[in-house]
């Protein structure tokens, strides 16, 4: 009799703090925690459909800590935000939001790109690409002599890889027409290799480029060189030069 | 674009009464605690009071317990402080904020100046 | 109340240069530390936030560190934007309280 009034007693008057779990200062058998030793939060616990008071060193995820004189409590940051430093500045979004300037979007605004990765808005990346590298010696067939016309290659590379709204890469080679020097080769002489013979293998992602290689080029339209006389050789170099025939794939 | 706007600053002798509003906007203005801090004439910032979201707690600064009220309307996203018993050291600069553990988000300020 | 010293009060520095600010606690406040940056007849506007948590919009020049009761705030290179008055501010404890300024100024 004397404890079911001692329990009795206890429910009518919940400031009670003797037997409190943990952190608690003071609480109640049916509320939990009432108040909190220092520095720790209040927050409310969502047990069945009753809430029950507990003290924490941190509030949980999605709440957030403000010390006030007379309480610490836990308060929920916005419903999109996971982790929060208040109301005002997420810092973690729930899935499917992106965080932009503290807040919970769900779509990017313009000029802004979603990072799938770390949930973000991040700026669009543009593709930025270096100056060209001079031309290549010109080569036919590997060799820099003889009078054959052949193909001559310059690249640049790529500073800076778009992201994915960013513009694409324009294309990192160019390969023209030009007449090989007009001077015989030696017997069994090797000619230098061009720098396109030298390229290195593209990095991953990029494709191959779409040069064409010189057998390909040396049956395009030619007038053999033996039927011109030189004046007319004179003026075909000179429009050879001016025509630049660009091939790549763009990245 | 969050907004907050100062009225209600003055001259006004020793003594005497003033009641500073703070207009809200671009915000859920129930969701957040409000505040007051001022700035003395060439002086450091200084917090004055705070109330709750929801106006059911109020916090102030030792120097204006009993002397300044902090109140707010949720209906007009209005914020106010009622300042008695003005003395010379009130004369200042006083914001509106937000307050979050910081002041994320402040007014313009409007002067008070106490002098006779 | 805690009590904050900001030094030094002012500080001449050329645009270029590298700044540090330091804040000094009268108690432990653990990380509960913001700062302001104020500039004549305007409002302060918050930089930072739990001594190192840059708001966004503020630019990366800027950074915070310490904890417990010393913090500092530095101004990796300062641009003419940034001379004007800084103000750091604790909140683990009411009432919260600012520093008294450090007001940085061109040489």
């Known amino acids: 009799q004397n404890a079911s009034r001692g329990r009795r007693q206890r429910r009518m008057h919940p400031n009670v703090s003797q037997g409190c779990q943990g952190g608690c200062a003071t609480c109640s058998d049916y509320n939990g925690c009432l108040s909190c030793k220092p520095r720790l939060f209040f927050a409310l616990e969502r047990i069945g459909m009753k809430q029950i008071g507990v003290c924490l060193s941190s509030c949980p995820s999605g709440y957030y800590g403000t010390r006030y004189p007379d309480i610490n409590k836990c308060t929920k940051c916005k419903a999109d935000c996971d982790t929060c430093f208040n109301k005002n500045f997420c810092t973690k979004c729930k899935s499917g939001f992106y965080l932009h300037l503290g807040k919970c979007l769900d779509n990017c605004p313009e000029g802004l790109e979603a990072n799938n990765h770390t949930m973000e808005c991040v700026s669009i990346v543009h593709c930025e690409v270096s100056e060209w590298n001079p031309w290549s010696p010109c080569t036919k067939k590997g060799k820099t002599c003889g009078f054959k016309r052949g193909t001559e290659t310059r690249v640049r590379e790529i500073i800076q890889h778009p992201s994915a709204k960013g513009n694409l890469c324009p294309p990192t080679n160019e390969t023209r027409k030009c007449t090989v020097q007009r001077k015989k080769c030696q017997k069994g002489e090797r000619g230098k290799k061009g720098r396109e013979r030298k390229r290195k293998k593209p990095n991953k992602g990029e494709s191959k480029e779409a040069i064409p290689d010189s057998k390909s080029l040396e049956s395009s339209k030619e007038i053999p060189e033996q039927r011109e006389n030189k004046q007319q050789q004179k003026k075909r170099k000179v429009q050879d030069k001016q025509k630049s025939v660009s091939v790549s794939t763009v990245h | 674009e969050v907004q907050l706007v100062e009225s209600g600053g003055g001259v006004v002798q020793p003594g005497r009464s003033l009641r500073l509003s703070c207009a809200a906007s671009g915000f859920t203005f129930s969701d957040y605690d409000m505040a007051w801090v001022r700035q003395a004439p060439g002086k450091g910032l200084e917090w004055v009071a705070t109330?709750?979201?929801?106006?059911?707690?109020?916090y102030y600064r030792d120097s204006v317990k009993g002397r300044f009220t902090i109140s707010r309307d949720n209906s007009k996203n209005t914020l106010y402080l009622q300042m008695n018993s003005l003395r010379a050291e009130d004369t200042a600069v006083y914001y509106c904020?937000?307050?979050?553990?910081?002041?994320?988000?402040w007014g313009q300020g409007t002067m008070v100046t106490v002098s006779s | 109340d805690i009590q904050l010293t900001q030094s030094p009060s002012s500080l001449s520095a050329s645009v270029g240069d590298r700044v540090t600010i330091t804040c000094r606690a009268s108690e432990d406040i653990y990380s509960d530390l913001a700062w302001y940056q104020q500039k004549p007849g305007k409002a302060p506007k918050l930089l930072i936030y739990d001594v190192n948590s840059l708001i966004h919009g503020v630019p990366s020049r800027f950074s915070g560190s310490g904890s417990g009761t010393d913090f500092t705030l530095t101004i990796s290179s300062l641009q003419p934007e940034d001379f004007a008055t800084y103000y750091c501010?604790?909140?683990?404890?009411?009432?919260?309280?600012f520093g008294q300024g450090t007001k940085l100024e061109i040489k």
């Open positions: 904020a937000t307050h979050d553990k910081t002041f994320d988000y």
């Open positions: 109330i709750i979201y929801d106006g059911s707690r109020t």
């Open positions: 501010q604790q909140y683990d404890n009411y009432p919260n309280t």
